[in-house]
Amino acid sequence: MMTGTIETTGNISAEKGGSIILQCHLSSTTAQVTQVNWEQQDQLLAICNADLGWHISPSFKDRVAPGPGLGLTLQSLTVNDTGEYFCIYHTYPDGTYTGRIFLEVLESSVAEHGARFQIP
């Protein structure tokens, strides 16, 4: 039975040209995290494998940095980066947990962080 929950940074906004940290945290489970995949739509941004380290997709290599932790730093933001981002936690023995973050990239400097929320 999957007992874990993923806490994410929720709905966030950031300024065009700036950077943002995408962060998820898995709690309420003793399952072992074997891998975390970061995706935008059907595009892979990066994978953090517990044994092998980080793989950044070639499409994002110039503006995605691993970390902090299992999170991901997205740099040189453009308006086209607005949208849904997913952290997919591969765990043993539970299986897969998915968290969602919505990022809005703003033209002006009125970017504010949204509230944190949980996905069961």
């Epitope: 595009q43 980080w54 793989h55 997709s57």
Partner: antibody, heavy 120, light 106 residues
Framework: EVQLQESGPGLVKPSETLSLTCAVS????????WNWIRQPPGKKLEYIGY???????YYNPSLKSRVTISRDTSKNQFSLKLSSVTAADTAVYYC??????????????WGQGTTVTVSS | DIVMTQSPDSLAVSLGERATINCRAS??????IAWYQQKPGQSPKLLIY??SYRYTGVPRFSGSGSGTDFTLTISSLQAEDVAVYYC?????????FGGGTKVEIK
Amino acid sequence: EVQLQESGPGLVKPSETLSLTCAVSGYSMTSDYWNWIRQPPGKKLEYIGYISYSGRTYYNPSLKSRVTISRDTSKNQFSLKLSSVTAADTAVYYCARGDYSNYGGAMYDWGQGTTVTVSS
Amino acid sequence: DIVMTQSPDSLAVSLGERATINCRASQGVSTTIAWYQQKPGQSPKLLIYSASYRYTGVPRFSGSGSGTDFTLTISSLQAEDVAVYYCQQYYSSPFTFGGGTKVEIK
């Protein structure tokens, strides 16, 4: 140029242990990760597992109870042991190198393969 | 495990013509797809990684797709392209391969 060379007995009796070695030349095994893959006659490639640059191992759950992958960095080689073999383990066995940072799970240097037949 | 299904099983194409091979994943695998070429009696060789990136020194071949559906295209078939082609996912462990597509000259 990196070269991988599999070696080991071509014939193994049922219920015995299959032992193969992959000798790596032209590159140090202290980085990247090192894989075993097999191909039964007329069937698709099957992933067996890996040993990482740090010595951590992953085994395909379908074979996990029977598989051990180890390494000897002083000899720049890694090994596969598969216990309690049956005719279904008859296959061409390949070793291969991966660079997770750049290529993820794509394996880009392969040995020529060694044929192992399980028969009494 | 993620099941990779290739189509067609075999393909006969005239020299200089385009060859297209399809690969479908049983669940979404984003862009974590590699393609390999295996000539008779040889080991597999990496052609494409991350669904669409050509490995060093690979000509004529291109890859596309994301999610569950992927394509390998040989733009102009040459005699040396006769081989079996395999897709592989590395979205999650264990890595899994398609059943292969045999490409021949018509």
